[in-house]
Structure formats: structure tokens, C-alpha cells
């Protein structure tokens, strides 16, 4: 199941998953001028067994010639539920972490890809908090938030962190303090209802769907 | 009038879940007007205002269709309505905007009193 | 939402011709431009996409062109099967928003 919400906000605080579960999805986005190729995947999908885990599908951008414009997607009055991306991060994860059974560890940069990352996680996802730059963290508990599902609804737990302003930052679990670049935005997606068998894309897309036929009926 | 529609789209031959399947409809002898999307697999619907609160879009991924439900029906509501696969990624709760490159062969819809 | 004018409204022509339609948006769409192509009773069949990329199996007769506000369908030598209606979409904006559509008839 896809979490139906995005990880809780704490105030001067930014997260990121160190793994990604089986079945989080990320979207195949491309930077400005480029487009994903008209027979490309839409989305890379995190799957595999209990020994060994991996993203499929390769997302593929390519030039747009005189596109140097992103499109105006913009929600409507009653989706203001804000969703959040995070930036591109590098694929270098905590050892422990990435190698987790059922999970993968952070997809590698595609040529042309989009500033920001787009997940999808699902539930059972972890992600790990830590304060901004200039903001020291007070810990009452776990500075993480779990995707859990109740009573057929998802929903996050609520990380024990408060971010007070001082010069100090706190670091996500096995990292080193950051060098020059800030850490990303808070990341993620969503929706509802998934099974990763559903989602079985684009190799057999460039057969099959070229005799695709939609038949619509009135009932 | 009043009364409402709801009118079915089967997808065949192709993965269906991860693809926005949009509403598009045209009255007799106009153009066409979109009215609203689905990417079944995130199950989160996306509407042209003009129809807000009047049009439901679903999807069931078991059986590859997708469903338009337009309610207090209008004589201007006559029309045939479209289903069409587009390649819209969901970014930030909204189906990315996009064309349209499958579409079914349409379901005349005729509000009558 | 993003209106899409069309130019003219009906084109009268004859086999062999070069024809040109123009769509107009109110305001930049960049790139973000599709035409269709669609015959009394049928759904529309997708011609062009991204301005002017050719959709697959569309005969090379067609092309398209443009940016920003103005663009341009063009058949090189109409043929007896491309008599239809024409319509462009603006997929820029949240809501897809097509032009009123150009018939194309036999003179």
C-alpha cells in the first residue's frame, strides 16, 4: 500500500529515507529542456526478494530543443493538502541501511534528470529527521517517522525532535556532518491502493500498448 | 435531467495501473473538453474545475477499468464521452498535464427529459 | 484556464495541397503542444506531440511547429484520407484546454 499522506513537518527540520522500501516509486522527472522519451518508464520501482532488492525500469530524458519551460501543475482548491519533493541527494547510503533486506538503496542519477526527486513511498517506509542548518536538535525519542497502516488507513508516526536555533546541526544516522551543500527538502509523494504486481511497466509497454484499445461503455 | 451517468472504460492490451486514463467528452457537433484523470494505481482523481462536485472519476486495477460518474445532468450534458491514456506522472498530489496518445471509441450520452 | 484559437475554423482544399493550420494560445505554452486528427463518429487519433514531434506510425506528410504561443500544423500534400477536423491541446496547464477544432474539407 502507498502511504495515503506525506512524513509528518517538524518546524527547521528536513528528512530522507537511508533505504526505500519494496514497492516505493519514483517518477522518471526531467530537468528543464528535456522530457522523458515518449517509450520510457514513468515511474522506477524498488523490487525484488528477501536477498536482493533493486530499482526497475530506467527512467530516460531527452532534449526537447526549444522547451526551457517546466509545466504550471498546479493543484486545485480542494487538493491543498501540500506534497513535497526533496532534492536529488547522492546514492551513497549507511552500509547498514541500504543493504536492508526488501530495500533499496538510493537509485543513481539518470542524464538529465530533474532537480527534485519525486517518491512514492509505502507503508512500513522509514525516514529520518534532522535539523537545518543553524538548528540544534532536542530529542524526546526517535528522530524518525514510520508509515504505518490502522484500521485500513496509513498513517505517520510523529517524530520525538525539536529544532532550536543554534549554530550546531544534528546528522541522520552513520553520516558525516555535511560539507558545502545543504541537505534536501522534505521529500515524498502519494496515494493509495497498490500492489507492486500491479505495476508491471514499460518493458512490455512498446508491444503491447501500440495495440492498446480502450473500450468505454455506458451503464 | 437530475439524474446521473456513469459510463465505463476497459483497458486492454497494456499495464494499466500506472497510467492517468483522462475524461474527455464532446457535444454534438463541438469540440473537445477535458474533465478530469485517474492514475489508477495511486487512486487519487484530478478535475476540470467547470465540473468540480459534479463529476467522479475511479478506477478498479482488477479489472483494468476506469469509471466517469456525472451527476445532475443537464441537457448540455449531451454528449460522447472519451476515455484516453495520457503520460502524466503524479507530482505533488496532481496527474502531471499531458496529451493523449489512446483513446476508447466513445460513449454517446443523451440527457433527454 | 489557457484558451487555444484556431486558424481558419474551415480550410478548403485539394488533394496534393500543402496545408497549414495555426492554434494561438493566451499565454506561453512553451513546447507543450499536441493535434489530433479525427473523422466524423471516431475519437481523435494523435498526430503530433511536444510541438513537433511526430507520433508513431503518423505519415511524415504531417509535421508541426512553433513555441511559446503560436503554432503551426502542416500536411505537405493532402491526401484523400487526412480530410477531418483538427485539434490542438495545451497540455501546460493543470487543465487541458483544446482549440475549437479546424475541418478541413474538399474544395
Known amino acids: 500500500e502507498l502511504c495515503d499522506d506525506d512524513p509528518p513537518e517538524i518546524p527547521h527540520a528536513t528528512f530522507k529515507a537511508m533505504a526505500y522500501k519494496e514497492g516505493t516509486m519514483l517518477n522518471c522527472e526531467c530537468k528543464r529542456g528535456f522530457r522523458r522519451i515518449k517509450s520510457g518508464s514513468l515511474y522506477m520501482l524498488c523490487t525484488g526478494n528477501s536477498s536482493h532488492s533493486s530499482w526497475d525500469n530506467q527512467c530516460q530524458c531527452t532534449s526537447s530543443a526549444t522547451r526551457n519551460t517546466t509545466k504550471q501543475v498546479t493543484p486545485q482548491p480542494e487538493e491543498q493538502k501540500e506534497r513535497k519533493t526533496t532534492e536529488m541527494q547522492s546514492p551513497m547510503q549507511p552500509v547498514d541501511q541500504a543493504s536492508l533486506p526488501g530495500h533499496c538503496r538510493e537509485p543513481p542519477p539518470w542524464e538529465n534528470e530533474a532537480t527534485e526527486r519525486i517518491y512514492h513511498f509505502v507503508v512500513g517506509q522509514m525516514v529520518y529527521y534532522q535539523c537545518v542548518q543553524g538548528y540544534r536538535a532536542l530529542h524526546r525519542g526517535p528522530a524518525e517517522s514510520v508509515c504505518k497502516m490502522t484500521h485500513g488507513k496509513t498513517r505517520w508516526t510523529q517524530p520525538q525532535l525539536i529544532c532550536t536555533g543554534e549554530m550546531e546541526t544534528s546528522q541522520f544516522p552513520g553520516e558525516e556532518k555535511p560539507q558545502a551543500s545543504p541537505e534536501g527538502r522534505p521529500e515524498s509523494e502519494t496515494s493509495c491502493l497498490v500492489t507492486t504486481t500491479d505495476f508491471q511497466i514499460q518493458t512490455e509497454m512498446a508491444a503491447t500498448m501500440e495495440t492498446s484499445i480502450f473500450t468505454t461503455e455506458y451503464q | 435531467p437530475g439524474s446521473s451517468v456513469k459510463v465505463s472504460c476497459k483497458a486492454s492490451g497494456g499495464t494499466f495501473s500506472s497510467y492517468a486514463i483522462s475524461w474527455v467528452r464532446q457535444a454534438p457537433g463541438q469540440g473537445l473538453e477535458w474533465m478530469g484523470g485517474i492514475i489508477p494505481i495511486f487512486g487519487t482523481a484530478n478535475y476540470a474545475q467547470k465540473f468540480q462536485g459534479r463529476v467522479t472519476i475511479t478506477a478498479d486495477k482488477s479489472t483494468s477499468t476506469a469509471y466517469m460518474e456525472l451527476s445532475s445532468l443537464r441537457s448540455d450534458d449531451t454528449a460522447v464521452y472519451y476515455c484516453a491514456r495520457d503520460l502524466g506522472t503524479m507530482v505533488r498530489g496532481v496527474i502531471e498535464p499531458y496529451y493523449f496518445d489512446y483513446w476508447g471509441q466513445g460513449t454517446l450520452v443523451t440527457v433527454s427529459s | 484556464d489557457i484558451q487555444m484559437t484556431q486558424s481558419p475554423s474551415t480550410l478548403s482544399a485539394s488533394v496534393g495541397d500543402r496545408v497549414t493550420i495555426t492554434c494561438r494560445a493566451s499565454?506561453?505554452?512553451?513546447?507543450?503542444l499536441a493535434w489530433y486528427q479525427q473523422k466524423p463518429g471516431k475519437a481523435p487519433k494523435l498526430l503530433i506531440y511536444?510541438?513537433?514531434s511526430l507520433e508513431s506510425g503518423v505519415p511524415s506528410r504531417f509535421s508541426g511547429s512553433g513555441s511559446g504561443t503560436e503554432f503551426t500544423l502542416t500536411i505537405s500534400s493532402l491526401q484523400p484520407d487526412d480530410f477531418a477536423t483538427y485539434y490542438c491541446?495545451?497540455?501546460?496547464?493543470?487543465?487541458?484546454?483544446f482549440g475549437q477544432g479546424t475541418k478541413v474539407e474538399i474544395k
Open positions: 511536444d510541438a513537433f
Open positions: 491541446q495545451q497540455y501546460n496547464s493543470y487543465s487541458r484546454t
Open positions: 499565454q506561453s505554452i512553451s513546447s507543450w
